[in-house]
């Protein structure tokens, strides 16, 4: 969490941002909140990006003002106009690109004063893994697949029964470049699995960590998966 304050002759207002990560090809949110004002026409929101000449987005006098918008953001940004009055200056970003990563500044002016806060935005690709029993294999084998990751993640297998065991000798992981030539499909195979055990396939890069679990018993197979973004710090 980053909390910024204004420093000019006018009073300063508190502006709060949260570091976040964007999944390339999908939409992202750059979070920013501020002390609200009672009059929408008195609020100015400016989003800037370090190293970028033009503005990322500007909202003032109750409407978007994009004449100074930088080329790389054209047609890709929007504020939640109906929420500005309650202090929400968050920015929606369409079709996140790798090059959108960087330091952003959320700069606010209201009748109460000015304030700003920086936000670190990481970009990459992350997706939920799915673990299945590979019935085509000669021995009991598990196959963990996740369709989109970038940068290249690490894959680690674990099991409930053999806690702390190193499965690197009995697993094989491959990375296959997807058609857009950036993200990769992750496939990891675990051999010699035993029945009545829960196995976890953990995929992690510097942006996200995802786990796919599979519980294999004689009578049923249960699956569960979850994904967690790393380094979501408020500012």
């Amino acid at each position: 969490l980053i909390i910024g304050f204004g420093i000019s002759g006018r009073h300063s207002i508190t502006v709060t941002t949260v570091a976040s990560a964007g999944n390339i090809g999908e939409d992202g949110i750059l979070s920013c909140t501020f002390e609200p004002d009672i009059k929408l026409s008195d609020i100015v929101i400016q989003w800037l990006k370090e190293g970028v000449l033009g503005l990322v987005h500007e909202f003032k006098e109750g409407k978007d003002e994009l004449s100074e918008q930088d080329e790389m953001f054209r047609g890709r940004t929007a504020v939640f106009a109906d929420q500005v009055i309650v202090g929400n200056a968050s920015l929606r970003l369409k079709n996140v690109q790798l090059t959108d990563a960087g330091t952003y500044k959320c700069y606010i002016i209201t009748s109460k004063g000015k304030g700003n806060a920086n936000l670190e935005y990481k970009t990459g690709a992350f997706s939920m893994p799915e673990v299945n029993v590979d019935y085509n294999a000669s021995s009991e084998t598990l196959r963990c697949e996740a369709p989109r990751w970038f940068p290249q993640p690490t894959v680690v297998w674990a099991s409930q029964v053999d806690q702390g065991a190193n499965f690197s000798e009995v697993s094989n992981t491959s990375f296959e470049l997807n058609s857009e030539n950036v993200t990769m499909k992750v496939v990891s195979v675990l051999y010699n699995v035993t029945i009545n055990n829960t196995y976890s396939c953990m995929i992690e890069n510097d942006i996200a960590k995802a786990t796919g679990d599979i519980k294999v018993t004689e009578s049923e197979i249960k699956r569960r998966s979850h994904l967690q973004l790393l380094n979501s710090k408020a500012s």
Epitope: G25, E65, L66, S67, E68, R74, G75, T77
Partner: antibody
């Protein structure tokens, strides 16, 4: 309320240039992009180009060499020019405005102007 | 270019019927799909944007769903004024593209 009104010559000779205007009201050209879409008689919709609030443009690659879009913010008017017209360019040409600043759909359309390419 | 394939290309239905039109994108377009209604000699009218958001003033019998590559426009109970041509379009990547249209006729 938001309005877009196209105007143009109606008939253009093959090989000549077409210049259309789109006069807008009810919103500012510094807030929204303006799209150009055409529809040949009895056919579907075809996206041609967009001019953004900043003045930068994006074109359908199939028309890149023949198309130029510009605007005058003070006159609230967008200009569309297509060169080297041929018979297959006969269509109704529309200008349209997006529903949001992130292009999620074309909410406001002009009435359209029919351009016939004929000698 | 992303192809938007609409089906069916024409459809006969009666007043009160529930009608579904589908649109398939040749690659993922997130939720950047919009639906339009067009009547002869008129400009298209936006019905649905962002795959599922009903545009201002559009009757609640129109609904949209889908994400990724598969999208649907549903008219829950056809009214006489709904007989028209419907188009889907994607605004995810350039060039923006439209489906070939579905002509909805009275049975």
């Amino acid at each position: 309320q938001v309005q877009l009104v196209e105007s143009g010559p109606g008939v253009v000779q093959p090989g000549r240039s077409l210049r259309l205007s789109c006069a807008v009201s009810g919103f500012s050209l510094t807030s929204y992009g303006v799209q150009w879409v055409r529809q040949a008689p009895g056919k579907g919709l075809e996206w041609l180009a967009v001019i953004w609030s900043s003045g930068s443009t994006d074109y359908n690659a199939a028309f890149l060499s023949r198309l130029t879009i510009s605007k005058d913010n003070s006159k609230s008017t967008v200009y569309f020019q297509m060169n080297s017209l041929r018979a297959e360019d006969t269509a109704v040409y529309y200008c349209a405005r997006d529903v949001t600043t992130i292009v999620e759909g074309f909410a406001h359309w002009g009435q359209g102007t029919l351009v016939t390419v004929s000698s | 270019d992303i192809q938007m394939t609409q089906s069916p290309s024409s459809l006969s239905a009666s007043v009160g019927d529930r009608v579904t039109i589908t649109c398939k994108a040749s690659e993922k377009v997130g939720t950047y799909v919009s639906w339009y209604q067009q009547k002869p000699g008129k400009a298209p009218k936006l019905l649905i944007y962002g795959a599922s958001n009903r545009y201002t003033g559009v009757p609640s019998r129109f609904s949209g769903s889908g994400s990724g590559t598969d999208f649907t426009l549903t008219i829950s109970s056809l009214q006489p004024e709904d007989f028209a041509t419907y188009y889907c379009g994607q605004t995810y990547s350039y060039p923006f593209t439209f489906g070939q249209g579905t002509k909805l006729e009275i049975k």
